[in-house]
């Protein structure tokens, strides 16, 4: 039931529009998407919100909304406005939000915006604005948010921005801006968010961001930058930086030394070849660092002071060694991907107590020592494929209670230690041509997927009769419970040529019943029969 006052309010609702009280004895009026070609005439003086978006309004007359002194939000988006005359918003003393996006404005309506002293949010995006007059925002002392994205700007309207000292967020994205001059935002000391993505920016003045002392988010993605934006060095409060999808070839030494608050840096899709060794130092808030294909990196980066890194990906470089103290710098590391490098020797990772995933495939590693992966209690996945590993210490994996995925394919193994691997669900040994011994399934009670060098080795896993097609399931089934991994026993693979064939086949029959769910490849078949097992045993 509505009060007499709200009933009176609703009687001032224009035809076809939807109206409701706003809880303060003022009226919210929704006239959107009604095909209107002009503003409704009988608006209540008590209107606080007026939505005229998605109509066919092509012009506003001077003073079209007389006496709406309580109006706080006016939406005119999605119309056909090409020009807004002086006086269009006269008398709107309370106006805080003005939405003019998705129209056909060719310049900022300077005169119409004069004296909107309460305006806090102005949307001018998705128009055809190519010109921003120098004084167009001069009366907007309260403006906090400004959208100028998706227009036709070719340069930063530096003069117009001088009066916006209260501005907190601005987007100039999706324009045709090609250069940012020095002090372009010199008076915007309250600005927290600045979006400049999807422009044509190819050069930055070396002091172009000076004055932006509150800036926390800077988006330079999808531009034409061919040099690292060193101008960011004055942004001491910067938390999020994006410059992905540019043409930057190198990141200099101490690149982010002026930005100690950085949490996120997005710089993928750049042809980065070189990164200064000190580039990522002293970033205590940084959690993720990803660098793929920087082929001129020969040394592991010095990450002093970047101790909270949780994920480090540095692939396709030419790193040949890791410092022995790598984990002292990175005690919180959970994911380490150093694949496609030239690593030969590995340090002990045991100080990296939080490591869950290590990817070292496609390196030059030849040996896994006893201390390399000791006591990594959280390690779930270890990829050592495509190396030159010939030797693995018998206890190299003995203290990895959470390990469920191990990839040692395409190495030079002739034997394989199983101590500590009883929790594995995924094991890859394919491509180790010298590894010809049979493997006992008893060591792997949790195993779901195994890939062996030879088909006959799959017979121990009950795959003789029905060839199992292994789809790419290596990365699936990562959620199994770790609760009882500590209860399982570990042992070494048994070399089967020490046993009578009959004994083996009896054992195998038992295994077959227990391991019907294991997927093993290459599957035995007509051209890779289990009978291959007999080859070396018929002659005694």
């Amino acid at each position: 039931s509505s009060s007499p006052r709200s009933g009176a309010l609703l009687r001032g609702c224009p035809t076809h529009c939807h109206c409701e009280p706003d809880g303060r004895m003022l009226l919210r009026v929704d006239c959107s998407d009604l095909g209107l070609s002009e503003l409704p005439s009988n608006l209540s003086v008590f209107t606080s919100y007026l939505d005229l978006s998605m109509n066919n309004i092509s012009q506003l007359l001077p003073n079209p909304l007389p006496s709406l002194r309580f109006l706080e939000e006016l939406r005119l988006a999605g119309n056909a406005l090409t020009y807004i005359p002086k006086g269009a918003f006269t008398g709107l003393y309370s106006l805080k939000v003005l939405m003019l996006q998705n129209n056909q404005l060719r310049q900022v309506p300077t005169e119409a915006l004069q004296n909107l002293r309460s305006l806090q949010s102005l949307r001018l995006d998705a128009n055809h604005i190519s010109y921003v007059p120098p004084s167009c925002f001069s009366g907007l002392h309260s403006l906090r948010h400004l959208w100028l994205d998706d227009n036709a700007l070719t340069e930063i309207p530096v003069q117009a921005f001088r009066s916006l000292s209260a501005l907190q967020a601005m987007t100039l994205a999706l324009n045709k801006i090609h250069h940012i001059p020095d002090y372009a935002f010199g008076n915007l000391s309250s600005l927290v968010v600045l979006h400049l993505h999807n422009n044509r920016i190819h050069s930055l003045g070396k002091k172009c961001f000076d004055g932006l002392h509150s800036l926390e988010t800077l988006d330079l993605n999808y531009n034409n930058l061919d040099e690292f934006p060193t101008a960011i060095r004055t942004l001491s409060n910067l938390k999020e930086l994006g410059f992905h999808s540019n043409n930057i070839r190198s990141i200099p030494e101490k690149a982010f030394v002026g930005n100690p608050s950085l949490i996120t840096i997005h710089f993928y899709d750049n042809p980065i070849q070189f990164v200064g060794r000190s580039a990522f130092q002293h970033l205590p808030e940084l959690r993720t660092l990803t660098l793929n294909g920087a082929s001129q990196i020969t040394e592991f980066p010095d990450l002093t002071g970047t101790a909270n890194l949780e994920s480090l990906t540095l692939t396709g470089a030419q790193i040949s060694s890791l410092p022995q103290t790598v984990c002292n710098q990175l005690p919180n590391l959970q994911v380490l991907d150093l694949s496609y490098n030239l690593l030969e020797d590995l340090p002990s990772f045991s100080v990296c107590q939080k490591l869950q995933k290590i990817d070292l495939r496609h390196n030059e590693i030849y040996e896994i020592k006893v201390d390399t992966f000791q006591q990594l209690l959280s390690l779930r996945s270890l990829n050592l494929a495509w190396n030159k590993i010939a030797i693995i210490h018998p206890n190299a994996f003995s203290t990895l209670p959470s390990l469920i995925k191990l990839d040692l394919s395409s190495n030079l193994l002739s034997s394989f230690p199983v101590t500590g691997l009883h929790g594995l669900t995924h094991l890859k040994l394919t491509g180790n041509h010298a590894l010809q011994s049979l493997i006992s399934s008893e060591n792997f009670p949790e195993l779901k997927i195994i890939e062996m060098p030879y088909a006959y080795q799959c017979c121990a896993f009950g795959v003789c009769e029905n060839a199992y097609k292994i789809s790419n399931q290596w990365n699936k089934g990562d959620n199994s419970s770790m609760d009882d991994l500590h209860k399982k026993d570990a042992g070494m693979f048994q070399v089967q040529d020490e046993r009578d064939l009959e004994d083996f086949l009896l054992d195998f029959e038992e295994d077959l019943k227990a391991l019907h769910s294991v997927q093993c490849s290459p599957s035995p078949g007509p051209f890779k029969p289990c009978e291959h097992l007999l080859d070396g045993w018929l002659i005694r």
Partner: antibody
């Protein structure tokens, strides 16, 4: 309140080395450029160079490049101007200043008088 | 380097009168809509004090008797009305390009 406090007056002989300091307080020291400006006795102002303490980025007036070095220690919010070999012509009052809006020199230290005489 | 020439080198003005100081640059100090000219006041035995930045913007705390104008190569500092404690040397400075340069100074005396 922003303050720049400079070290005291120095009297040196030609060929000697010297380092003078400028300690900033009341603002984020690493986020603003510190400039060095000199004023020879009875003369006008001359810009020597600047440093951004947060990044150790420096810009020098070519006239002074190689003769002076500008540095900073952000841990103690202090900028330095140093000479490895002073000349009599280095006699002047040296000011440090903190950058302001649009590269103006908004705050100034009290100045350090350096006298170089044999 | 951009050379800044101030004139006059000195002037004497009575309190309540207008003082006008000009600064001419050897090349334009305009860049992308901004004119990078600043004005400073220096009293004997004191460091300079910023009065006006970017040609015409009054620094906080500076009385509005001080004003600046100009663009390109020609700039003016005006003090109106002059007061007794305005006696000082006034310098213009450009930072459109490095090295930053100062004018030679204009000494204002109060009659």
């Amino acid at each position: 309140e922003v303050q720049l406090v400079q070290s005291g007056a120095e009297v040196k002989k030609p060929g000697e080395s010297l380092r003078i300091s400028c300690k900033g307080s009341g603002y984020s020291f690493t986020a603003y450029w510190i400039e060095w400006v000199r004023q020879a006795p009875g003369k006008g102002l001359e810009w020597i160079g600047e440093i951004l303490p947060g990044s150790d980025s420096t810009n020098y007036n070519e006239k002074f490049k190689g003769h002076v070095t500008i540095s900073a220690d952000k841990s103690i919010s202090t900028a330095y101007l140093q000479w490895s070999s002073l000349k009599a012509s280095d006699t002047a009052v040296y000011y440090c200043a903190r950058s302001g809006l649009y590269g103006s020199s908004q705050y100034w230290g009290q100045g350090t008088l350096v006298t170089v005489s044999s | 380097d951009i050379v800044l020439t101030q004139s006059p080198a000195s002037l004497a003005v009575s309190p309540g009168q207008r003082a006008t100081i000009t600064c001419r640059a050897s090349e334009s100090v305009d860049s992308y809509g901004n004119s990078f000219m600043h004005w400073y006041q220096q009293k004997p035995g004191q460091p300079p004090k910023l009065l006006i930045y970017l040609t015409s913007n009054l620094e906080s705390g500076v009385p509005d008797r001080f004003s600046g104008s100009g663009s390109g190569t020609d700039f003016t500092l005006t003090i109106n009305p002059v007061e007794a404690n305005d006696a000082a040397t006034y310098y213009c400075q450009q930072n459109a390009e490095d090295p930053r340069t100062f004018g030679g100074g204009t000494k204002l005396e109060i009659k």
